[in-house]
């Protein structure tokens, strides 16, 4: 009896694992083995596929074959008993195009109100992703074990910290990788769960802000208790993108080691141009807090986020405010090539009751004013990037009197 060739051959590639699966074409014939050949582009001869010769099952692994993953290859399979079937040719494919990203490796670290997630590629020193190792981004789904309400977090890197969690609570999460440059989305890791610790005696410092004064940076934060000492550390932000189990070498800011106030001042030349992460820790001599939330600090934005300049056109019941670019010392406007949002505060000159308007536009109407009344206005700019969370200082207040009634047209 003639053996039929196997059908429906599927090639599954996950990271560096190459798996072939196929269907037997004749279940009634026993003791059949299967063998594969492969052929590279531009070659005429077929080569035996190591790891996939005389296979008794309907699955084989040819991961040991050292292929150029960007080069197209063709496979063929036949069945063998006393005689052999005809060859069945599989459509040619390029391994890299066919490959899926496998589940990443995940390590979790618990604090009282935070979890640190360390993510690394599932396959160490992968050949498939050798040129893309630095391009991996990750996304995760996290939920409280007790509620199951899921929160998705996109576009994270190999170390990510989730804050504002509850102490002594079990959280579960799963992570998948993506290579956006190749439009590839990976498969999720297994679910990992971790319980946050009992609440720490000392909370971490909060509301960290950086401002510029003269040639110095001024770092300020809030703290619940008095008589504490604080230390501040920095890290290059790009290091968070490093793949694998990286050693994050947080560095001390010399002028911010063991400070006894909730601020520290250090020279601008401590940092070269770049984007940094800053964190603060509190200690009372016996106990130490966990580190604060890490804030992103961009020296470019920090140095040049100046207060906005504005003109006021006064009407009887409103002001029209036109916001322009801030001026440098030489009276030349500063080009700010990142999106800003403006906070405008106004009040009646004779009162302390302030009102606030937040606006993205550079022309703003301040409504509901009384005629012939002096109002004062000040403004500041904020970056729209949540992570940078930068604000200029307020401009000087400008005071104007509204026009008499019926001039609003």
């Amino acid at each position: 009896k003639n053996l039929k060739s196997p059908q429906k051959v599927e090639v599954d590639i996950i990271d560096d694992n190459f798996i072939l699966r196929w269907n037997r074409s004749d279940e009634s014939v026993g003791n059949v083995t299967f063998s594969f050949d492969y052929q590279k582009t531009g070659m005429d001869n077929w080569i035996k596929l190591s790891g996939c010769q005389n296979i008794t099952s309907t699955k084989c692994n040819f991961s040991s074959l050292k292929l150029n993953v960007y080069e197209e290859i063709k496979l063929r399979i036949r069945a063998e008993k006393e005689n052999t079937s005809s060859w069945y040719e599989v459509d040619s494919f390029t391994p890299f195009r066919k490959a899926q990203i496998g589940p990443p490796e995940v390590h979790l670290e618990a604090e009282d109100k935070a979890i640190v997630i360390h993510i690394s590629p599932g396959t160490k020193d992968s050949v498939m992703w050798a040129l893309d190792g630095l391009s991996f981004t990750y996304s995760l789904v996290i939920w409280k074990n007790s509620s199951g309400v899921e929160e998705r977090i996109e576009n994270i890197y190999s170390r990510h910290k989730i804050y504002k969690l509850s102490p002594e609570t079990t959280y579960c999460l799963k992570v998948k990788a993506a290579l956006l440059t190749s439009w590839k989305i990976g498969v999720y890791s297994p679910v990992h769960c971790i319980k946050t610790t009992v609440e720490n005696e000392l909370p971490p410092p909060e509301n960290i802000e950086v401002s510029v004064q003269n040639q110095n940076y001024v770092l300020k934060w809030d703290y619940t208790y008095a008589n504490m000492t604080f230390q501040v550390q920095w890290l290059h932000a790009f290091l968070k993108r490093n793949p694998g189990n990286h050693l994050y070498k947080w560095k001390q800011i010399p002028d911010c080691e063991n400070v006894k106030t909730t601020q520290c001042v250090f020279p601008q030349n401590v940092f070269q141009k770049g984007i940094y992460l800053l964190r603060v820790q509190a200690s009372d001599g016996n106990n130490t807090s966990f580190w604060s939330e890490e804030i992103k600090f961009d020296t470019e934005i920090q140095a040049f986020l100046l207060p906005p300049v504005f003109n006021i056109r006064s009407l009887s019941d409103s002001f029209h405010i036109y916001i322009g670019a801030p001026k440098q010392s030489g009276n030349t406007p500063v080009i700010q090539d990142y999106p800003l949002i403006y906070e405008i505060i106004f009040w009646e000159n004779t009162s302390n009751a302030e009102r606030k308007i937040i606006e993205k536009k550079t022309d703003v109407t301040v409504p509901n004013l009384k005629p012939l009344t002096v109002y004062c206005v000040k403004a500041r700019a904020h970056t729209m990037d949540e992570k940078l969370n930068k604000s200029s200082v307020f401009s000087d207040a400008v005071c104007e009197k509204t026009k008499p009634g019926n001039t609003s047209k």
Partner: antibody
């Protein structure tokens, strides 16, 4: 293969100084922190301090401040521990160890160097 | 400094038994705790990091657990080669500190 090869045993007089070495192979010390640990019979393990070989930044346990000095030479992939003003309390085995990931503590250790302080 | 207390200086067990070595931190150290095994005349061998993760090559009969201030190293199905001293260590804050060690003796 990762290895930390420590220098040989030392017999030194009280008041003298000694410099121990730890030569790494199989990895670049610039990509790690190098730690030193003291072990005394019946006293267990004591952490001395660590150095970042990339820039020389150090951290010491308060007890070893002034007693121990950590240095590193990246060209020879070697970390050093200098102990000064030696007394019988410094008689111990000293280990170097590396930290190469923020996940780990010390994942590879040297074989230890025995220091005996005696007149 | 954070004090790591291993209250049991020594423990006696039999081959095949399950034994738990405990360690208490004087303040919350999250999960930044490591465990080491040390045999006489040898350097410490890392077993566990981040309180519960095994280093590669460590047999799965070694299990770490705990967070905050209370940590446990459990050895299930104890083997004769597990006769050693076990140390916990915190690496949440400098200075890093070790527990005093627990000697495991085989009956």
């Amino acid at each position: 293969e990762v290895q930390l090869q420590q220098s040989g045993a030392e017999l030194v007089k009280p008041g003298a100084s000694v410099k121990l070495s730890c030569t790494a192979s199989g990895f670049n010390i610039k990509d790690s922190y190098m730690h030193w640990v003291k072990e005394r019979t019946e006293q267990g393990l004591e952490w001395i301090g660590r150095i970042d070989p990339e820039d020389g930044e150090t951290n010491y346990a308060p007890k070893f401040q002034g007693k121990a000095t950590l240095t590193a030479d990246t060209s020879s992939n070697t970390a050093y521990l200098q102990l000064s003003g030696l007394t019988s309390e410094d008689t111990a085995v000293y280990y170097c160890a590396r930290r190469v990931s923020s996940l780990y503590a010390m994942d590879y250790w040297g074989q230890g160097t025995s220091v005996t302080v005696s007149s | 400094d954070i004090v790591m207390t291993q209250s049991q200086k020594s423990m006696s067990t039999s081959v095949g038994d399950r034994v738990s070595v405990t360690c208490k931190a004087s303040q919350n150290v999250g999960t930044n705790v490591a465990w080491y095994q040390q045999k006489p005349g040898q350097s410490p061998k890392p077993l566990i990091y981040l309180a519960s993760y095994r280093y590669s090559g460590v047999p799965d009969r070694f299990t770490g657990s705990g967070s905050g201030t209370d940590f446990t190293l459990t050895i299930s199905n104890v083997q004769s080669e597990d006769l050693a001293e076990y140390f916990c260590q915190q690496y949440n804050n400098y200075p890093w500190t070790f527990g005093g060690g627990t000697k495991l003796e085989i009956k």
